[in-house]
Interface confidence: medium
């Protein structure tokens, strides 16, 4: 099925050009999306092209600038946030990235009523996190690992926590491992719906081993970066959840929320917090052995000023075939009765579906079902539930938005997006206004992305928010590669693949093949999305065929495929890439002497193992920032899939699944190993150990390090990286430069 045909006709051929590497590195063909910043049922804010902050009212059709670009520029603001009472705006500047989500910044508060910045009791700098209360204009912020509260922007701050200490105690913000592997946010504090209470997490990293690496900088001596980072089997952070009454913070003080007994009996994690009402909160906990999750609903007890979490309000989710949840345990979406909720978890057939839980998980009512998966619940209103799934036409790499009417019986289901722009749009996400009065649809492809605004009652399209016209025009004279998404059936396993073919692809000719792999648990590479990237260039200009294959361990096709890799990382993911390559060779247009594989991060691990598989299939390959041993990676992620590296658990497979153990097998392939020296995530240690093992085995290989670069290899390093990898592949495939 050809999803994105090239617009090449013979008469036009002389005016068309192939993609260049420069196009990719310059981001010439990048697209825009439009996500409204909703502030009510019918109003949203958007930053205009000239940097004014504009308020749009859908119903009146009016728009006006609430904050001028002049005001933004006066403090070099790169971001903003309007207080819910619309009296103040915070302006964010001096952005300084820390880890994946976290950053520090300077914040200024602008008073919209008098058009001036708030003077007196200004915020300290730099701040680690800042947010408005959901009602009014209270502020909560984290500074030097402690939480502060302001009733009004001009007030002095009220200090809630005092024990915050760099790399030791984190209040209201996650430590490294919780940020990257559990919360996936820069914050760990949550306002109750009306701002009465503020819940926050305290992470104690005192006993966690520290990863230390050099940051070379420009000084005479490098400095050492120290991060408490629990690797597999190491001591983990100790988490506690507190809730403070923001009306009387000094007199009542923070109250700790109790941990369910069945969780507290051994090492555990806190996984998420969801406010239900101002006086009801839902916490999710997870055993360190991540196959048991407990959802605990807690109520405020006025008489004792404490939070009570009765056993009758504990809901257990357990997996007997793998780990709990998908990548993360799903979060509940509560209904209007403030006790029942909707949640995605595996049904009896092993597919993730929406369930409605009223009293117990055992009595859950299944809302969706089929040999496909519900992926996200966007919004529950009085009469509708909006969700996304990959049901339509049985393509796992698509995303469509559905509406289930929950007000009527039996509930009826409608696909909102399936037939809107069927060829162009098969992968959607959505953003809803209050009470789902309106929503925005953002289509990511396979055609050029488009964002549209819709009526929440009728689903009618109101207007196009962004259609990427400039991009469409720019691509008119570009020879884009063809893309097809198909599947292979091998030994009762379905292997979906995406193939990117040169513009003048001729099935009777032979082409070099590059496999791009990620392959991590609960990932998906074969998606119906638009992209003009490095592999597009390799197909368009260099005439390569590129393939992406979703093998065992990947997501959204049921638990059998997902949990196949449980406790066995590095086996089936590699096997399935190899199997797919063999099938591609059988198709007749692959030059089997010119096959390469490359991947980044988990993909670097898989590509390394594939190269060292001893099959003789691959001529060469690249591993960027690979994991080389699961003993070197983060506890939360690794143990989810591998258990513990102890003799009585899974130490044997930890040892068997390293790249180093297969050093000898690299002798007959060309291997390019790449890593950033300041990688906080997959430590440089991983590549250092691969290199050491290869040297000890007297195996020749190529390597590139990027000084002071992290896991993303950003900035100028990106250009250098892709240029370097391009040369390596062209040399491997004997393509002229």
């Amino acid at each position: 099925i050809v999803l994105r045909p090239s617009r090449v006709h013979n008469s036009e051929e002389n005016t068309m050009r192939a993609l260049t590497l420069k196009d990719i590195l310059n981001g010439t063909f990048s697209y825009k999306t439009f996500f409204p910043n909703w502030i009510s049922g019918q109003e949203y804010l958007h930053q205009s092209a000239d940097n004014n902050i504009v308020l749009y009212n859908i119903e009146t059709g009016q728009s006006y600038t609430i904050l001028s670009n002049r005001t933004m520029k006066s403090v070099n603001a790169s971001n903003y946030g309007l207080s819910p009472d619309r009296q103040f705006v915070y302006l964010e500047s001096d952005y300084s990235k820390l880890w994946r989500y976290s950053y520090t910044a300077t914040y200024y508060i602008y008073d919209l009523s008098n058009g001036e910045f708030v003077r007196g009791n200004e915020l300290p700098r730099p701040i680690q996190y800042l947010c408005w209360s959901p009602v009014g204009s209270k502020l909560a912020y984290v500074y030097q690992n402690n939480i502060y509260l302001k009733q009004r922007p001009g007030d002095p701050p009220f200090q809630i926590t005092f024990n915050g200490r760099e790399n030791k105690i984190f209040n209201g913000i996650p430590d490294w491992v919780y940020e990257e592997e559990m919360l996936a946010t820069k914050y760990a504090l949550w306002w109750s719906p009306n701002g009465k209470f503020l819940a926050y997490a305290e992470f104690n990293d005192t006993d966690i081993p520290v990863i230390a690496y050099s940051y070379y900088g420009d000084e005479q001596y490098p400095r050492t970066i120290n991060i408490p980072y629990p690797k597999a089997g190491a001591k983990n952070p100790v988490v506690r959840i507190f809730i403070i009454d923001t009306t009387y913070p000094a007199y009542v003080g923070p109250q700790e929320v109790p941990v369910p007994a069945m969780i507290a009996s051994s090492d555990y994690y806190f996984s998420w917090l969801t406010w239900v009402t101002d006086e009801r909160v839902c916490l999710q906990w997870l055993k360190r052995v991540q196959n048991v999750s407990v959802l605990s609903i807690c109520d405020f007890r006025e008489d004792w000023q404490t939070w009570d979490c009765p056993k009758t309000q504990e809901h257990i989710e357990e997996s007997r075939t793998g780990w709990a949840g998908g990548f993360f345990v799903s979060t509940p979406v509560f209904s209007y009765d403030a006790i029942s909720y909707y949640k995605i978890f595996s049904d009896k057939d092993g597919y993730k579906h929406i369930h409605y839980i009223k009293d117990t998980v055992e009595n859950a009512i299944q809302i969706t079902s089929g040999k496909w998966e519900a992926i996200n619940i966007f919004r529950v209103t009085q009469d509708s539930l909006f969700y996304s799934s990959n049901e339509f036409e049985e393509y796992p790499g698509r995303r469509n938005i559905y509406r289930i009417s929950i007000g009527s019986y039996p509930p009826s289901k409608k696909c909102v997006t399936c037939h809107l722009r069927k060829e162009r749009c098969q992968y959607y996400t959505a953003s809803f206004s209050d009470y789902a009065k309106y929503y925005a649809l953002v289509c990511y492809g396979p055609g050029i992305p488009i964002s549209t605004l819709h009526d929440g009652r009728t689903d009618q399209e109101i207007k196009i928010l962004e259609e990427n016209k400039e991009l469409e025009n720019a691509l008119k004279n570009i020879q884009l590669p063809k893309e097809e998404i198909k599947k292979l059936e091998v030994d009762e396993i379905t292997l979906w693949y995406k193939m990117i073919l040169p513009p003048q692809f001729d099935r009777s000719k032979k082409y070099p093949l590059l496999i791009q792999v990620y392959g991590g648990p609960c990932s998906q590479s074969v998606r119906s999305v638009f992209a003009v990237n490095w592999i597009s260039y390799l197909a368009s200009k260099e005439g390569m065929v590129i393939a992406l294959v979703d093998g065992r361990g990947t997501a959204f096709q049921g638990d059998k495929l997902l949990y196949a890799v449980y406790r066995k990382l590095g086996v089936y993911e590699v096997e399935d890439q190899i199997t797919a390559v063999r099938k591609f060779i059988e198709m007749g247009f692959i030059d089997e002497k010119r096959i390469a594989i490359w991947g980044w991060s988990y993909g670097g691990y898989v590509s390394s193992l594939a190269l060292a598989s001893g099959t003789g299939l691959f001529k060469c390959g690249i591993a960027v920032a690979p994991v080389s041993s699961w003993e070197y990676y983060a506890s939360v992620y690794t143990e989810r899939f591998m258990g513990l590296p102890t003799k009585d658990d899974n130490l044997e497979h930890y040892k068997n699944s390293t790249v180093m153990a297969r050093a000898e097998y690299f002798r007959n392939v060309d291997y390019l190993l790449i890593h950033g020296t300041a990688d906080d995530n997959v430590h440089f240690q991983n590549s250092a150990q691969i290199a050491k093992a290869l040297v000890n085995a007297q195996v020749d290989f190529q390597a590139m390090w990027y000084s002071d670069q992290n896991h993303g290899l950003s900035g100028l390093s990106t250009n250098h990286l892709y240029t370097h990898m391009t040369h390596f592949l062209k040399q491997c495939f004997s393509l002229s430069d």
Partner: antibody, heavy 119, light 107 residues
Amino acid sequence: QVQLLESGGGVVQPGRSLRLSCAASGFTFSSYAMHWVRQAPGKGLEWVAFISHDGNRNSYADSVRGRFTISRDNSKNTLYLQMNSLRAEDTAVYYCARDLGYYNGFSYWGQGTLVTVSA
Amino acid sequence: DIVMTQSPSSVSASVGDRVTITCRASQGISSWLAWYQQKPGKAPKLLIYAASSLQSGVPSRFSGSGSGTDFTLTISSLQPEDFATYYCQQANSFPPTFGPGTKVDIK
């Protein structure tokens, strides 16, 4: 204007009980948290107890916790302090004070009522 | 509990003098400090809250400053009615605690 008037003080034997009252006027009593603060003869000020505007939250100093109970009747604009198991060290002038609001200071004070605990 | 200390414990001054009283907290309290004036036989009266904000009705000769652990109350020009005992109070963490007081008397 804001007025706070304490009553109920007097001489009491150790181990006995006493109930103090504070009548409020000149402001919307139900909107403010209230406190009791005491001052032993010739000594400094010591905070005793707090109650939220709606009566749902209260807090006590360690020295009185379990013996004293703060309460209020918003319909009567009155604050109370029930003092049980009184000790000699509880001898002091007891002031009721209106909370400053979010700032947790004491914006207005009553004139005080003397409690003497003596055998 | 946060311990508050004041210095000096007493000060003798004349009308028109500038008087400065300092207050120190045993741990950081941000700006959550109040100052009170108490005359013999009377109830305390709030002068300054949030370290530097003047309570309404209080003469502008009274001012407060400081944050963290060190705070100051300044009377720019002492008046006859200002002879009294002054207390600081922290309001940042439970329980609220007072300093021991500073007595300002006539020289």
